[in-house]
Interface confidence: low
């Protein structure tokens, strides 16, 4: 049993680490394989992760992280039965991946705009909280070529669209995902997209 | 506003059980632990030990291993502490402390239950 | 388990002047030591955590400072209202542990 892509993890920096690693044969993750992760300060216990199937060969685990401290290191082994078959540190304030933009809705607004809303994932108390900034992606159903990008770092998670800027008639899709530069973060995963239907003559429709 | 708000005080005999509850409001129940903290009367702080309302794992001081017992109600966003076979020195106001995000610090704090033992 | 020793359990002041809090740890914490306040009858306050960052809301007149072992806590120009027990607190391993408390008083 041998690892052929060693555990890459990233971590909420809230509540949730996820490791992925991949094996070089197909595993049944859950039944051959545990990770065992302790936090590096004396005191702290000893947990284990049940890892699940992504794939064949391709094995997740997501450990419960409670109030991750930026110092915070993790040692994490991966064991096969009584097999080590790798060992490492994980840092989780240096491995962010924020939770993925929550609730995203269009809504008419004044002026021929549409208001695209979306909720912040983190609580107002965490750090994470005021250090996102977002990329909205928009783009035409049935014209793969008509597509907007959007960065959005001012602090609201909102964003104001020119109905003007869109075809007119045309299906657009919108999807969310948000960055925390601080922490110089990946990016989350994209929200659900949110359809809707770009007519904006008259307004008085919607 | 984030609030945590705990029962009524209570007043026991000795070898008796008390259950105290922390209602925690205002934020994700499972987001943040809670500690759980002793103070005597006219006493300092001693931190009795957290449970991860993420996972539901305990962690006990060393003093409170035994006859304490943290649990949860993740529905109703309540902590508990259970307190066996009671005695005269467990007489003491217990606090529920939800933990901060970035630091270990404990940064709500319940109103206190004061528990007293006496035959 | 580590021990958190608060060297005053007493200290008095005046209005407006500044006092300091000394709290050392039997071992190195690193920066791992929160700051609290209570005051009688009501529940501890949190106002400094990771030894020097002020917790939401708390005015600029408390600061902290220290690493390691040797941790002080300040309150630079003291008021009326911060008549209260204040504690010192290690998060570094568990169980954490609390320091005796030091009482100010106002003169």
């Known amino acids: 049993v041998k690892v052929l892509h060693e555990p890459s993890c990233f971590s909420d920096y809230i509540s949730t680490s996820v490791c992925q690693w991949k094996m070089d044969h197909p595993t049944n993750c859950s039944a051959e394989l545990r990770l065992s992760y302790q936090l590096d300060f004396m005191g702290s216990e000893n947990h284990t992760c049940v890892p699940e199937n992504r794939e064949d060969s391709v094995c997740v685990c997501s450990m419960p992280i409670d109030d991750a401290v930026e110092a915070d290191v993790y040692q994490l082994d991966l064991w096969a039965g009584q097999q080590l078959l790798w060992s490492g540190s994980f840092q989780p304030s240096k491995h962010v991946k924020p939770r993925t933009p929550g609730n995203l809705t269009v809504h008419p607004n004044i002026s021929h705009t549409w208001l695209l809303m979306w909720t912040n994932p983190y609580p107002t108390e965490n750090h994470l909280h005021s250090e996102l900034t977002y990329m909205v992606n928009v783009s035409n159903d049935n014209d793969p070529e008509d597509f907007k990008v959007y960065n959005v770092t001012y602090m609201g998670p909102t964003l104001r669209l020119a109905a003007s800027t869109l075809k007119s008639g045309a299906s657009y899709s919108a999807r969310v995902r948000a960055w925390a530069q601080t922490y110089n973060s990946t990016w989350s995963d994209w929200s659900p997209s949110t359809t809707w239907l770009n007519y904006y003559e008259p307004w008085e429709q919607h | 506003q984030i609030q945590l708000i705990q029962s009524g005080p209570e007043l026991k005999k000795p070898g008796e059980t008390v259950k105290i509850s922390c209602k925690a409001s205002?934020?994700?129940?499972?987001?943040?632990?809670m500690s759980w903290v002793k103070q005597a009367p006219g006493k300092g702080l001693k931190w009795m030990g957290w449970?991860?309302?993420?996972?539901?794992?305990?962690t006990y001081a060393d003093d409170f291993k035994g006859r304490f017992a943290f649990s949860l109600e993740t529905s109703a966003s309540t902590a508990y502490l259970q307190i066996n076979n009671l005695k005269n020195e467990d007489t003491a106001s217990y606090f529920c402390?939800?933990?901060?995000?970035?630091?270990?610090?404990?940064?709500?704090w319940g109103q206190g239950t004061l528990v007293t033992v006496s035959a | 388990d580590i021990v958190m020793t608060q060297s005053h359990k007493f200290m008095s002041t005046s209005v407006g002047d500044r006092v300091s809090i000394t709290c050392k740890a039997s071992?190195?914490?690193?920066?791992?030591v929160a700051w609290y306040q209570q005051k009688p009858g009501q529940s501890p306050k949190l106002l400094i955590y990771?030894?020097?960052y002020r917790y939401t809301g708390v005015p600029d007149r408390f600061t902290g400072s220290g690493s390691g072992t040797d941790f002080t806590f300040t309150i630079t120009s003291v008021q009326t209202e911060d008549l209260a027990v204040y504690y010192c607190?290690?998060?570094?391993?568990?169980?954490?542990?609390f320091g005796g408390g030091t009482k100010l008083e106002i003169k």
């Open positions: 607190q290690q998060h570094y391993s568990t169980p954490w542990t």
């Open positions: 402390a939800r933990h901060t995000f970035q630091s270990r610090g404990l940064a709500y």
């Open positions: 071992q190195d914490v690193i920066t791992t």
């Open positions: 990771s030894a020097s």
């Open positions: 205002g934020y994700t129940f499972t987001t943040f632990g």
């Open positions: 449970i991860s309302t993420y996972s539901g794992v305990p």
